[in-house]
């Protein structure tokens, strides 16, 4: 047989969940177990993703859609479609090649994933440090020392002026 497409392609009639079987005069055959085709007119079905090891099944494979995986507890997804699972760390840590390590002084991580980031430099905005940073939390910046006149609140900064076209945050 000829394995190329003709102008009037009989395979276009094959629905999702089937493949166009060249060995049987291009009839539509069901996808074999553990495979799927999510669109019509397919020449072969695709292998269902298997959620093994650190992956666990979030959605089972069907004849028309692939399985979807997420990660077992203690791990989180990375990449498109959860292509990788990465170990969780505690807040205040980051994952290195040698495992979870505490954030260096001056950095923090408030999540179980990702890297430690530097504390905000309040002075760059002309502000002062209101609450010191920790390994788990960024510093909280307050008004500049000059704004702290007697009687002024040291916690609530003055409300910014509303600009046209901007919603309140």
């Amino acid at each position: 047989f000829e394995r190329t497409r003709s102008l009037q392609d009989p395979c276009s009639n094959c629905p999702a969940g089937t493949f166009c079987d060249n060995n049987r005069n291009q009839i539509c055959s069901p996808c074999p177990p553990n495979s799927f085709s999510s669109a019509g007119g397919q020449r072969t079905c695709d292998i269902c993703r298997q959620c093994k090891g650190v992956f666990r099944t979030r959605k089972e494979c069907s004849s028309t859609s692939n399985a979807e995986c997420d990660c077992t507890p203690g791990f989180h997804c990375l990449g498109a479609g959860c292509s990788m699972c990465e170990q969780d760390c505690k807040q205040g840590q980051e994952l290195t090649k040698k495992g979870c390590k505490d954030c260096c002084f001056g950095t923090f991580n408030d999540q179980k994933r990702g890297i430690c980031r530097p504390w905000t430099n309040c002075s760059l905005d002309g502000k002062s440090v209101l609450v010191n940073g920790t390994k788990e939390r960024d510093v909280v910046c307050g008004p500049s020392p000059a704004d702290l006149s007697p009687g002024a609140s040291s916690v609530t900064p003055p409300a910014p002026a509303r600009e046209p076209g901007h919603s309140p945050q």
């Epitope: 394995r3 190329t4 055959s29």
Partner: antibody, heavy 117, light 105 residues
Framework: VQLQESGGGLVKPGGSLKLSCAAS????????MHWVRQAPEKGLEWVAY????????YYADTVTGRFTISRDNAKNTLFLQMTSLRSEDTAMYYC???????????WGQGTTLTVSS | IVITQSPAILSASPGEKVTMTCRAS?????MHWYQQKPGSSPKPWIY???NLASGVPARFSGSGSGTSYSLTVSRVEAEDAATYYC?????????FGSGTKLEIK
């Protein structure tokens, strides 16, 4: 339908090599493709599979992390990038097309890889 | 999934009926078979357990289910001398049997 492998040769252990498979006579982009190998005087061993759109890729445990299968549908070509080669990778390497029942319905003539110091 | 193929060597006279077997370590949906002669690429021979590939003589047949599959030649001919490999694909990607070499006396 024709499949023609190329790129085999003699490589030292730890070395790298890239095999190619040129396809013609069918709509290459519609079909999953495989690499299968056969060591001298031994049986057939499946190596890797790539789906038609490259969204599903599988490897045999023996090559995972060392071999990479890829394809260029615009050029009707299948590739196998091999790194950290070992003497046990010495074999005839065949490319083969995938049928809907997941068997290998067309095979190339093969290209020989020899890994030896 | 591991496939155990037997016998390793099968010797038969022309006209004889022969059967070779593949057993899978767990249940599979289909078994496929290939014929390979020395110096040549494998040829698809039987697919999806019982369907003959294009050009395969009708004296060949395939059967089986679950974990046990077989290829039978009703009347062996000299041109059938070759090594036959079974292959499965189920949930684990692809594995082959170790091959049965059919020799003609």
């Amino acid at each position: 339908v024709q499949l023609q492998e190329s790129g085999g040769g003699l490589v030292k252990p730890g070395g790298s090599l890239k095999l190619s498979c040129a396809a013609s006579g069918f709509t290459f982009s519609d079909y999953g493709m495989h690499w299968v190998r056969q060591a001298p005087e031994k049986g057939l061993e499946w190596v890797a599979y790539i789906s038609s759109g490259s969204n599903s890729i599988y490897y045999a445990d023996t090559v995972t992390g060392r071999f990479t299968i890829s394809r260029d549908n615009a050029k009707n070509t299948l590739f196998l990038q091999m790194t950290s080669l070992r003497s046990e990778d010495t074999a005839m390497y065949y490319c083969a097309s995938n049928n809907g029942y997941f068997y290998f319905d067309y095979w190339g003539q093969g290209t020989t890889l020899t890994v030896s110091s | 999934i591991v496939i155990t193929q037997s016998p390793a060597i099968l010797s038969a006279s022309p006209g004889e009926k022969v059967t070779m077997t593949c057993r899978a370590s767990s249940s599979v949906s289909y078994m496929h078979w290939y014929q390979q002669k020395p110096g040549s690429s494998p040829k698809p021979w039987i697919y999806a357990t019982s369907n003959l590939a294009s050009g395969v003589p009708a004296r060949f047949s395939g059967s089986g289910s679950g974990t046990s599959y077989s290829l039978t030649v009703s009347r062996v001919e000299a041109e059938d001398a070759a090594t036959y490999y079974c292959q499965q694909w189920s949930s684990d990607p692809f594995t082959f049997g170790s091959g049965t070499k059919l020799e003609i006396k």
